[in-house]
Every structure is written in C-alpha cells, then in structure tokens.
C-alpha cells in the first residue's frame, strides 16, 4: 500500500484549511499556550511494524475528527471551511482504512498497538478537558488548532518514514 | 538544520529608508512567528514587535508602533523590517528570532546573526 | 506592559562558584518566563524556556526555577564559557520584555 501517494496531498489540505480556520488574532492568546503533552514517541516510527503505524495515524486523525466534530466547534469555526476539513479527514481516513486491509497477512505482528492508540486517546482527552475548563473560549480553540496543526506536521514526518519503508 | 539568516550590515543618513531582512530555512517557514529585537549599542535587549507569516499578522511593541513595519513573504521564506526614515537613534544591532506561535515549545530557540543598522550623517 | 527586574545588574565570581540571578515580574506571569545568554558581538541563546525547561544542548549546570512574580536562573558551577550576559524575559503577553541585564565577570 502506497500510503503516501494518496494520503499526503489531503494531509497537506488539511493543514491549509486548518491555517484558514482561525477567527481571532493569536496573538491575544500567549497566555492560554498549554503543555497537552504531545506523544511524540508514538509519532517517531521506529518500534513499528508499518501496520501498527497506520493504526496510530488513524486514531488521531479519528480523534480528530471527533473533536472538530463537537456542537461547541461547529459554533466557533466557519461552516464552509470546516465541512472542507471534515472531507479531507474522511479521505484520510478511508486511505488509510484500505492501507490496514492490505496489510492483513503481511506481517506477522498484530494490526494494532493497544499501548499506542491508548496514549493518543489519552493525548486527545486533554485536550478535551483543556476547552471545557476554559468554557470553549475562542483563545482556547486558537491554542487547540495550533496544537493539532503541529500533530498533523509531525504525523506527516511519520508518513514520510512509512514511504521510505516501502 | 535550522537557520535565520540576516542581510549584511548598513550604513545610512538620517531619513533615508531602510528595509533588512531574515530568511528563515530547515523548518516549515509558517509554523513559527518571526519577531524582532533591538539592541542599542552596549545596552540591552528590545522587543520591536512579531508577524506570523501564515497571514502577516503583525503585533508591535508600543515604543515602536508607526516607527518600522515588520513585513514577510512566506513564498521565500523571508521576514523583514523596515523604516521609511531613519533617525540616528535607530543606529542598533537588529536581531530576528523564530517564536513557536501558540505552541508549548521555547521561544526564540533560533536567533539570525544579527543586522546592525548605523544612521548617521 | 509588564516589567522586568533582574539582580543584580553584575555580579563576579570565579570558575567553579554557584551563581544565582533573580528576575521579577511587575505582576504574576505564572511559568511565562525565558533565561537567555548573550556574549559580546553575538546573538542572544535560549537557555531556559517556561521557567525550568533546559533547551535542547544547553549544559546541565544551568537550572531555572520560580512561578508567578519571582525566578532564579543558577549556574551550579560557572566554567570560563559562562561569562556572558544573562536576560530573563516574559512570554505571557504582548508586549514581550525583557530584564536589564546580569553581567557576569571573572573575578
């Protein structure tokens, strides 16, 4: 499965549609930056069979895809750019999907690494329990679509590796 | 690896206009701000203002607000300073620094060579 | 805008001393706060970034510590390559300020 081929022009999209998104100045929202821990291991690649790395990237884009998915998102971000996002999160999501099936029988280790999706759940509930102690304000999504704009950058480093591993 | 590379040193007369600029290179050139820092000679350092170049959002410094405009074209990677009339008081060493924007990561982790600017007549 | 105080403004000491520098903050700036180095003719280094986190390659000897309105930044044992100027800096809002300035000399 050539991941990348289909799956790296809609990360890109996404990224662009993401930077399109914001509705305040940033630069009034210094002091909402929070540390959402961020798993980078889990993004680094090497302890994982290819399988296992695409089991990781869809749950976050999954995870994703939840959160942006929220009544309290829908009343912050423009409608047209976020039904543009949610497309390009099922393409990816599809992509990757079909990825999965392909690699069943190939190797010998298991599809999925529970550890890995648990600690990118995990990364995901924080970032949750972040934007309800802080009410959902428009800052606290400003900070929330930095952060998944930067997850989104590194997990295309991953994709990257993947190719390379082909 | 990453870099910010400044232009080369001025020299210019009072009034005279002057833009400088920092190109950034080793890492995705919108995913971080671009701000910019003053040091009077032997004295400390001034923070003159920031621009992120996804959208050239631009914040400044009250001791420098309708003093320079901060400028970039993300299209080569290249953020600048300007000024459309020098005063001998803008004779400084003029640094840019890369910032994280909102991310939990360290400001101004990477710093360009430094400009210096010297106005006189 | 929120000022910054360092102390002292110099200080010398010797290879091998503890060095401690202060920085306060005119109002609370929870861990917003950034040490960097400077030596003569060259940029400013990042030394430490939200109060206590070392940045990547900075040597170990060099701690920070404090939230809210006081912090520290401690070289545990100068070496001839510390002398320099040390800034604290504030990151929680516009506009960013920098301290004065620690000069610090060889005895």
């Known amino acids: 499965c050539d991941l990348p081929q289909t799956h790296s022009l809609s990360n890109r999209r996404t990224l662009m549609i993401m930077a399109q998104m914001g509705r305040i100045s940033p630069f009034s929202c210094l002091k909402d930056r929070h540390d959402f821990g961020f798993p980078q291991e889990e993004f680094d690649g090497n302890q994982f069979q290819k399988a296992q790395a695409i089991s990781v990237l869809h749950e976050m884009i999954q995870q994703t895809f939840n959160l942006f998915s929220t009544k309290d998102s829908s009343a912050t971000w423009d409608e047209t750019l976020l039904d543009k996002f949610y497309t390009e999160l099922y393409q990816q999501l599809n992509d990757l999907e079909a990825c999965m099936m392909q690699e069943v029988g190939v190797e010998d280790t298991p599809l999925m690494n529970v550890d890995s999706i648990l600690t990118v759940r995990k990364y995901f509930q924080r970032i949750t329990l972040y934007l309800t102690e802080k009410k959902y304000s428009p800052c606290a999504w400003e900070v929330v679509r930095a952060e998944i704009m930067r997850s989104f950058s590194l997990s295309a480093n991953l994709q990257e590796r993947l190719r390379r591993k082909e | 690896e990453v870099q910010l590379v400044q232009s080369g040193a001025e020299v210019k007369k009072p009034g005279e206009s002057l833009k400088i600029s920092c190109k950034g290179s080793g890492y995705s050139f919108t995913s971080y701000w671009i701000g910019w820092v003053r040091q009077m000679p032997g004295k400390g350092l001034e923070w003159m203002g920031i621009i992120d170049p996804s959208d050239s959002d631009t914040a400044y410094s009250p001791s420098f607000q309708g003093q320079v405009t901060i400028s970039a074209d993300k299209s080569i990677s290249t953020a600048y300073l300007q000024w459309s009339s020098l005063k001998a008081s803008d004779t400084a060493m003029y640094y840019c620094?890369?910032?994280?924007?909102?991310?939990?990561?360290?400001?101004?982790?990477?710093w360009g060579q430094g400009t210096l600017v010297t106005v006189s007549s | 805008d929120i000022q910054m105080t360092q102390s002292p403004s110099s200080l010398s000491a010797s290879v091998g001393d503890r060095v401690t520098i202060t920085c306060r903050a005119s109002?609370?700036?929870?861990?917003?706060l950034n040490w960097y180095q400077q030596k003569p003719g060259k940029a400013p280094k990042l030394l430490i970034y939200f109060a206590s986190s070392l940045q990547s390659g900075v040597p170990s000897r060099f701690s920070g510590s404090g939230s809210g309105t006081d912090f520290t930044l401690t070289i545990s044992s100068l070496q001839p390559e510390d002398f320099a100027t040390y800034y604290c800096?504030?990151?929680?809002?516009?506009?960013?300020?920098f301290g004065q300035g620690t000069k610090v000399e060889i005895k």
């Open positions: 800096q504030q990151s929680i809002d516009f506009p960013l300020t």
């Open positions: 620094a890369r910032h994280p924007g909102l991310n939990w990561a360290p400001d101004f982790d990477y």
């Open positions: 109002q609370s700036i929870a861990e917003f």
